[in-house]
Every structure is written in structure tokens, then in C-alpha cells.
């Protein structure tokens, strides 16, 4: 699910900016599965560079070969570079692994722009800064690719964390996380804290920056403030959820809620932007433009193409509105809202202007395949993928970028009727699962 505007993401900082943290509220939600509390060995195990992906270190084979792997909740294959490529510093060498097993089967994954193809096999896999286990997992050894690997991104493969239904070549290929849960006592849950930078990083800073945390098997309380609110996973393919209302600075977009989920809404760590269906995008941009009308920006900025720059430290955050998405709650007729700041949806871009400037791209864009809650959303929150209970949790991230006036928020409950009607039912055809590249 990588490429197009799904170009992966950006690096960030570990601690809350300006030393600001929300006070802890009492956790009202019921017990989550898995270990709760501290996962010290997994905190800060992600790295990333602006717009190029959050990756975790993994080892494959015997003896172990270390690779950086993009964390992608929008796909379901574990695929790694397995042949020389100009953008790869290292790659998986199957011939050097005594535990590699060839499945004698090929896999081909086309995207809207680009593709990768390879050979399927299994090998032993572990995550050094993860649970202390080794599992035999399916691996797609990428032998050929086009516009997949990113020059300078520092990752050599992709870890698809979604469900088997969207695995390639078909749903019989067990995804990594399923293998992990089956072969160990690790609970069927993981959580992500992606920490956006909030300001352009120079190359030295970008390489050294902490990008966030992937907690496998549970929830780490140190990574969020306030309480966790859960939305049901509508269907186990992508991490599909239902949005019931959208507000810009508290103003309802007043659209039929089906439009927000046409043809689906997913949580996808491998997408940079908040991507919205065409009608919703147009309404949202109109509303954001109106809210920020004291300054005008070029048309290309709203298309996510042109960058806008301000003198360093003078970005007028206050003129840009907050964006709120209301998600279906776990209780009938109850919803909650997640609110992001311009610090999340204006993406800092490095290396384009002088050091006297802070430059940004508008990171809300148009989609023809539904809403994609990418890094722009996830960087504001600690996101819990509670697969065991078929739900996704959101809490305010302890590392989200904000200012002294506003903070990202997760609030509820709100009374919302007929939320089931907000889901779009995709007509089932033989090709319905071929929507890999989402431009």
C-alpha cells in the first residue's frame, strides 16, 4: 500500500514539545488484552525521515541478517529487498541463510505508480527491539521493483501488519503478525506511537531522530495521556473504521456520513497524508481556506504540491483550523472525536529553502479509494490495534507536536444515531481485492 501519495512518512522527536503534557485521566476503558504498562525494550524502536517512512529493525535468517523494515498497517505482506538495488545499502541474501525455505511461488504487487515482484519463502524472523521471540514467517524476497524503494529512506523492506484478506498473492499467505501470535504467547495486539518532527530537520538531525514506538503485544502507558477511546474494526482486511462526522474548527461539514467512508476508511501507517474522498476533500479544503482566510496561499499548495515558507519560527499556526474526525464508538449510538492540529496536517519539508525558513506541504489530499488516516492523523495519537477485540484505540500521543494554545485531543462520548448507515458496502466482484495502489 506504499507509493503515490502513500509515500511513507517522517522522523520525529521522542518527548512532548515545549515540555507540555496533558494530565493523566483515569482509564475508564475495560482491560485490554496483553501486558499493560511498561514495554521499555520496545519504546523508541522506530526511526524515520520526513515523508519517507517509519521503520523498525528486524533480523531474518540464520545467522541473522539485520534489515530496516517499514511499518505498514495498510498492507499484509512481509517483503524485503533480496537483490542489489541502487537505493539499498543492504539486502536479504537467502543463500546465506541455513533456515531459508523456498515456497516455489512468485508474487507480483502492482501499485498505481510502480510495483514490486519477488519469490515467496519462509525464514526465521525476530525484532531486536521487540519481544524476545523468533518466528518462522512468510517472506517475499523482492527481486525486481519500480518506484518502490526510496533513495535515502534507510529501509530495505516492508512489514504489512493488516489482515490476510489483502495479502498477495492471496489470503492463504499468512501475514507476519498472525504467524507471531500463533507461534508464541504474545497477545494479538500491537500499538503505534509515530512522532512527527513538527519542523524541518536537516539531514544530520533527521538521521539521528527518534521516530516513535511499535509496542508488540500490548499498550505502554508512558506513550499517551488521557484515556483510550476505541472504535470497532468494521472488517478485517485493512484496518477499516467508520467516520460519522467531520468538523473544521468545530464547523460540521454537514455531508451524508456515507461520503466520509466512500469506499472505505482505513488507518494506514504507510501513508503520509490524511486522504479524503473527492467530495469530502473539496468541502474540507473550502472550509480550511475559509478559516485561514486572513492569509491566502497558492492553488498548488492546497493540492499538496507547492510548499509555503515562513521565516523560521513565525509559522502562523493560529490561523489554521483544527480538523476533527468523529469515529463510531463501541457503544450503540455513541461516538468520540479525534482532533488534529495544523502541526500535524502541515508537513515540514527539509532542504528546499534557507535555514531562515520553515517550509511546509499541505498534507491533506484527495483519494479515489476512500479515507486514509495516514501519518498526519497517527502522529497526533497513540494508536492501539487491538486485533483480539476487533477494535482500534486512540489516545493523545505524549510526543505529538503542539503549541501553548492548542493540543490534539481525543474526546467523548457524543450521541450519534444510525452510525451503521455511515459504512459503505463495496459491491463484491472478483477484482475487489486488487486495489493495492491508492494514488
Amino acid at each position: 500500500t506504499h507509493l503515490g501519495i502513500r509515500l511513507p512518512l517522517r522522523s520525529g522527536l521522542a518527548g512532548p514539545p515545549l515540555g507540555l503534557r496533558l494530565p493523566r485521566e483515569t482509564d475508564e476503558e475495560s482491560e485490554e488484552p496483553g501486558r499493560r504498562g511498561s514495554f521499555v525494550e520496545m519504546v523508541d524502536n522506530l526511526r524515520g525521515k520526513s515523508g519517507q517512512g517509519y521503520y523498525v529493525e528486524m533480523t531474518v535468517g540464520s545467522p541473522p541478517q539485520t534489515l530496516n523494515i517499514l511499518v505498514d498497517t495498510g498492507s499484509s505482506n512481509f517483503a524485503v529487498g533480496a537483490a542489489p538495488h541502487p537505493f539499498l545499502h543492504r539486502y536479504y541474501q537467502r543463500q546465506l541463510s541455513s533456515t531459508y525455505r523456498d515456497l516455489r511461488k512468485g508474487v507480483y504487487v502492482p501499485y498505481t505508480q510502480g510495483k514490486w515482484e519477488g519469490e515467496l519463502g519462509t525464514d526465521l524472523v525476530s525484532i531486536p527491539h521487540g519481544p524476545n521471540v523468533t518466528v518462522r514467517a512468510n517472506i517475499a524476497a523482492i527481486t525486481e521493483s519500480d518506484k518502490f524503494f526510496i533513495n535515502g529512506s534507510n529501509w530495505e523492506g516492508i512489514l504489512g501488519l493488516a489482515y490476510a484478506e489483502i495479502a498477495r498473492p492471496d489470503d492463504s499467505l499468512e501475514p507476519f503478525f498472525d504467524s507471531l501470535v500463533k507461534q508464541t504467547h504474545i497477545p494479538n495486539i500491537f500499538s503505534l506511537q509515530l512522532c512527527g518532527a513538527g519542523f524541518p530537520l536537516n539531514q544530520t538531525e533527521a538521521l539521528a531522530s527518534v521516530g516513535g514506538s511499535m509496542i508488540i503485544g500490548g499498550i505502554d502507558h508512558s506513550l499517551y495521556t488521557g484515556r483510550l477511546w476505541y472504535t470497532p474494526i468494521r472488517r478485517e482486511w485493512y484496518y477499516e473504521v467508520i467516520i460519522v462526522r467531520v468538523e473544521i474548527n468545530g464547523q460540521d461539514l454537514k455531508m451524508d456520513c456515507k461520503e466520509y467512508n466512500y469506499d472505505k476508511s482505513i488507518v494506514d501507517s504507510g501513508t503520509t497524508n490524511l486522504r479524503l474522498p473527492k467530495k469530502v476533500f473539496e468541502a474540507a479544503v473550502k472550509s480550511i481556506k475559509a478559516a485561514s482566510s486572513t492569509e491566502k496561499f497558492p492553488d498548488g499548495f492546497w493540492l499538496g504540491e507547492q510548499l509555503v515558507c515562513w521565516q523560521a519560527g513565525t509559522t502562523p499556526w493560529n490561523i489554521f483550523p483544527v480538523i476533527s474526525l468523529y469515529l463510531m464508538g463501541e457503544v450503540t449510538n455513541q461516538s468520540f472525536r479525534i482532533t488534529i492540529l495544523p502541526q500535524q496536517y502541515l508537513r515540514p519539508v527539509e532542504d528546499v529553502a534557507t535555514s531562515q525558513d520553515d517550509c511546509y506541504k499541505f498534507a491533506v489530499s484527495q483519494s479515489s479509494t476512500g479515507t486514509v488516516m495516514g501519518a498526519v492523523i497517527m502522529e497526533g495519537f497513540y494508536v492501539v490495534f487491538d486485533r483480539a477485540r476487533k477494535r482500534i484505540g486512540f489516545a493523545v500521543s505524549a510526543c505529538h507536536v503542539h503549541d501553548e494554545f492548542r493540543t490534539a485531543a481525543v474526546e467523548g462520548p457524543f450521541v450519534t444515531a444510525d452510525m451503521e448507515d455511515c459504512g459503505y458496502n463495496i459491491p463484491q466482484t472478483d477484482e475487489s481485492t486488487l486495489m493495492t495502489g491508492r494514488a
Epitope: E295, K296, P298, D299, G300, Q306, C309, V352
Partner: antibody
Framework: QLQLQESGPGLVKPSETLSLTCTVS??????????WGWIRQPPGKGLEWIGQ???????FYNPSLKSRVTISVDTSKNQFSLKLSSVTAADTAVYYC????????????WGRGTLVTVSS | EIVLTQSPATLSLSPGERATLSCRAS??????LAWFQQKPGQAPRLLIY???NRATGIPARFSGSGSGTDFTLTISSLEPEDFAVYYC??????????FGGGTKVEIK
């Protein structure tokens, strides 16, 4: 059709403030479709963007000049102005006012320009 | 900072000949590039915007092409009034403050 005309003193002493006005005729400066900008060109050299303003008063300045530049707008007079303080001989140039159109991106209409010499 | 490099600095051609001017950006500017013409003692005039769109009133002999880092302004058949200095400008990074150094097209 819409025209732009720069006006102001052609000679300014070093350390003083250069002040120029651009008068918009044949159209309204309050159009929501445009920014209004200043560009200069030292004799025999290339073009340098100074800054721009929207009719609401929102401004953007060249970082290298920002500490010395002020651009303002007077919608009642259909004018916008440039002030550049603490001038030196390096500020000697032809100063152009221009309209930023095509989605606020391109300078599609220019004034004729006025030469300002900084000399004692 | 994005730097625009124009080449050649001077182009000596005869009327009726084809002129090809180059503008290279130090990094991608997508298609957000303009070309201007400036005659002695006059203000610049917008010829091309968005790399390939002719501005209002610009003759068809002027055409722009390119995207990313390499751009070309072509004058298919030089008229006497086309001898001037030509500047490119990127607006990918906004406000639009970066101009190229210029190419002078002179009569051979």
C-alpha cells in the same frame, strides 16, 4: 485594462528610508484573486523578489531583507507601498511593482519600474 | 535553497532561427516554473507559466517544456522583437522568490 505605476523619489541618501508607492488603476486592489508584490533589479543584474501583500494586509518578505522591509496596502486609494530602511549603495536598483496572479503564483502584470539611486 | 541555473548566458542567433534556452533547478520544482522576457528599459513580461502554459497574448512561437529539474524555453523562429533577456522563476517554494540569472538572446 489594469495598470500598475510606481512613484517615489529617485534619489535616497545612505542610511535613510526608501519609500515607493504603486498605484493600481483599471481594477481593484481588493480583488481576492491576487497578491501585490515588489521586485527589484540592480543595474545590469538579475531580478530579486522583495516581498508581497494581500489586500487584507497579509505580507511575505524576502528573508534577506525582512529586517528592513515594510509593505503596506491602502485599499481606499487602491495603492500599496514599499519602505526599505537603512539603505546603502547596494540598494540602488530599478524597483518594480507587480501583480501575483494565476493562483497567487506568477507575476503576470508589472509596472514600468522606477530607478532609485542611493547616494549622498 | 533552490538555485536556478540558466544556460547559455548568451545566445547569438539570426532572425528566423530556432532558440533553445535552458533552466536547471538544483532540486525538483515539479512544473512550477515561469519564463519572463525583458527588453532593455522595460519591465519583465510573463511568457510561460506552469512550465508549458502560454500567458495571455503570447505568440505561439514561444513554448515551454520540462518538469522536475530541467526546463526549456523554445522560440521556434526568432522575430526581431524577440532579442531580449529571458529569466526563469520557480514558484514551487512559495512565496516565489527565486529567479534564474538570465539568458541574453542577441542578434548574430
Amino acid at each position: 485594462q489594469l495598470q500598475l505605476q510606481e512613484s517615489g523619489p529617485g534619489l535616497v541618501k545612505p542610511s535613510e528610508t526608501l519609500s515607493l508607492t504603486c498605484t493600481v488603476s483599471g481594477g481593484s486592489i481588493s480583488s481576492s484573486s491576487y497578491y501585490w508584490g515588489w521586485i527589484r533589479q540592480p543595474p545590469g543584474k538579475g531580478l530579486e523578489w522583495i516581498g508581497q501583500i494581500y489586500y487584507s494586509g497579509s505580507t511575505f518578505y524576502n528573508p534577506s531583507l525582512k529586517s528592513r522591509v515594510t509593505i503596506s496596502v491602502d485599499t481606499s486609494k487602491n495603492q500599496f507601498s514599499l519602505k526599505l530602511s537603512s539603505v546603502t549603495a547596494a540598494d540602488t536598483a530599478v524597483y518594480y511593482c507587480a501583480r501575483l496572479g494565476h493562483g497567487y503564483s506568477y507575476f503576470d502584470l508589472w509596472g514600468r519600474g522606477t530607478l532609485v539611486t542611493v547616494s549622498s | 535553497e533552490i538555485v536556478l541555473t540558466q544556460s547559455p548566458a548568451t545566445l547569438s542567433l539570426s532572425p528566423g532561427e530556432r532558440a533553445t534556452l535552458s533552466c536547471r533547478a538544483s532540486q525538483s520544482v515539479s512544473s512550477y516554473l515561469a519564463w519572463f522576457q525583458q527588453k532593455p528599459g522595460q519591465a519583465p513580461r510573463l511568457l510561460i507559466y506552469d512550465a508549458s502554459n502560454r500567458a495571455t497574448g503570447i505568440p505561439a512561437r514561444f513554448s515551454g517544456s520540462g518538469s522536475g529539474t530541467d526546463f526549456t524555453l523554445t522560440i521556434s523562429s526568432l522575430e526581431p522583437e524577440d532579442f531580449a533577456v529571458y529569466y526563469c522563476q520557480q514558484v514551487y517554494v512559495w512565496p516565489p522568490r527565486t529567479f534564474g540569472g538570465g539568458t541574453k538572446v542577441e542578434i548574430k
